[in-house]
Amino acid sequence: AESCTSRPHITVVEGEPFYLKHCSCSLAHEIETTTKSWYKSSGSQEHVELNPRSSSRIALHDCVLEFWPVELNDTGSYFFQMKNYTQKWKLNVIRRNKHSCFTERQVTSKIVEVKKFFQITCENSYYQTLVNSTSLYKNCKKLLLENNKNPTIKKNAEFEDQGYYSCVHFLHHNGKLFNITKTFNITIVEDRSNIVPVLLGPKLNHVAVELGKNVRLNCSALLNEEDVIYWMFGEENGSDPNIHEEKEMRIMTPEGKWHASKVLRIENIGESNLNVLYNCTVASTGGTDTKSFILVRKADMADIPGHVFTR
């Protein structure tokens, strides 16, 4: 069964069949005797009850209010009322683009990675029994596909597949021909599965320190799940008991990559910790990125240009 219309704000294109289905449908069947009413309000008109006599374009079936077709003047608020249950929708009917096979404001955008599986299936479950034929267009040019009931594209994406794909369903109702259009804007992008990991911030960092004090060197990177971030430092410092690597912290980015941070803590800084490279590396199978930290005694700061310092 077709799911109910739960979105409270709906935009549709003039001239197409359209329906609203309330969300207490199963309940309505149980209490057949209960009075069920549909209302519309727009501008000056408050809560006008709808029935087939209101307009030859309107049909009521159990849980559904149908428009054959929907027109610009159908814009407004719609209410379904049954006992103490009310559902409300705000309907905005927009003008059809007469110069194109689709209306730009009614396009669903999809991003597909090159070489990944790409599928478009033309289906419309609600009007399925009324559909005579369906055509699929790419950039408003009809594609010749075998199945004219549910045309489908299934392939590995190529850059040439980018474009606007419109499924147009043709159906008859009361002797009239209607069509319903669903358009997808398909953008083909480079494979995003792996990024080249990168460390954030300058590649060389002089850090002003005082002997006997502690310092925390923070290394942050943008990387893939399988990538690693680690510290390497001079061989003579390899087993320095005053050097500690803190636990790595990771946060997932909205794009599905990772932001990682790893701190090297040097306690009780001694002469042996000065002027040696502490290297932080992020590594993947595709490459590495390294940034270096050098501890410099505060007294020696004057010898180094200010722009190379991190504090």
Partner: nanobody, 115 residues
Framework: EVQLVESGGGLVQAGGSLRLSCTTS????????MGWFRQTPGKQRELVAR???????SYADSVKGRFTISRDNAKNTVYLQMSSLKPEDTANYLC?????????WGQGTQVTVSS
């Protein structure tokens, strides 16, 4: 393609020992720094021990004094001697090169320490 093959894991009682091996087919093994990483489900890989081409070693605080990393360049193998094992050492152990692009990860070798 260069392959990394880890072995030597198993089930051991707390306080016990294991010796892990990692063999690579890489022709640059003798000049690569190598590291042992470990990973527990849902966590990122943590570098626990590293060894430079010159044989200098360093360790994560959590394993210092208990784990020893070594290498045999003639056999293209790096080892991790693990002693005084603790339940928190339970993980999948993997090796890889350091300081250069990672080799494709091996399957790892599972170490389980029971209390």
């Amino acid at each position: 393609e260069v392959q990394l093959v880890e072995s030597g894991g198993g089930l051991v009682q707390a306080g016990g020992s294991l010796r892990l091996s990692c063999t690579t087919s890489g022709s640059t093994f003798s000049i690569d720094a190598m590291g042992w990483f470990r990973q527990t489900p849902g966590k990122q890989r943590e570098l626990v021990a590293r060894i430079t081409n010159g044989g200098s070693t360093s360790y994560a605080d959590s394993v210092k004094g208990r784990f020893t990393i070594s290498r045999d360049n003639a056999k293209n193998t790096v080892y991790l001697q693990m002693s005084s094992l603790k339940p928190e050492d339970t993980a999948n152990y993997l090796c890889n090169v350091l300081g250069t692009a990672l080799r494709p990860w091996g399957q790892g070798t599972q170490v389980t320490v029971s209390s």
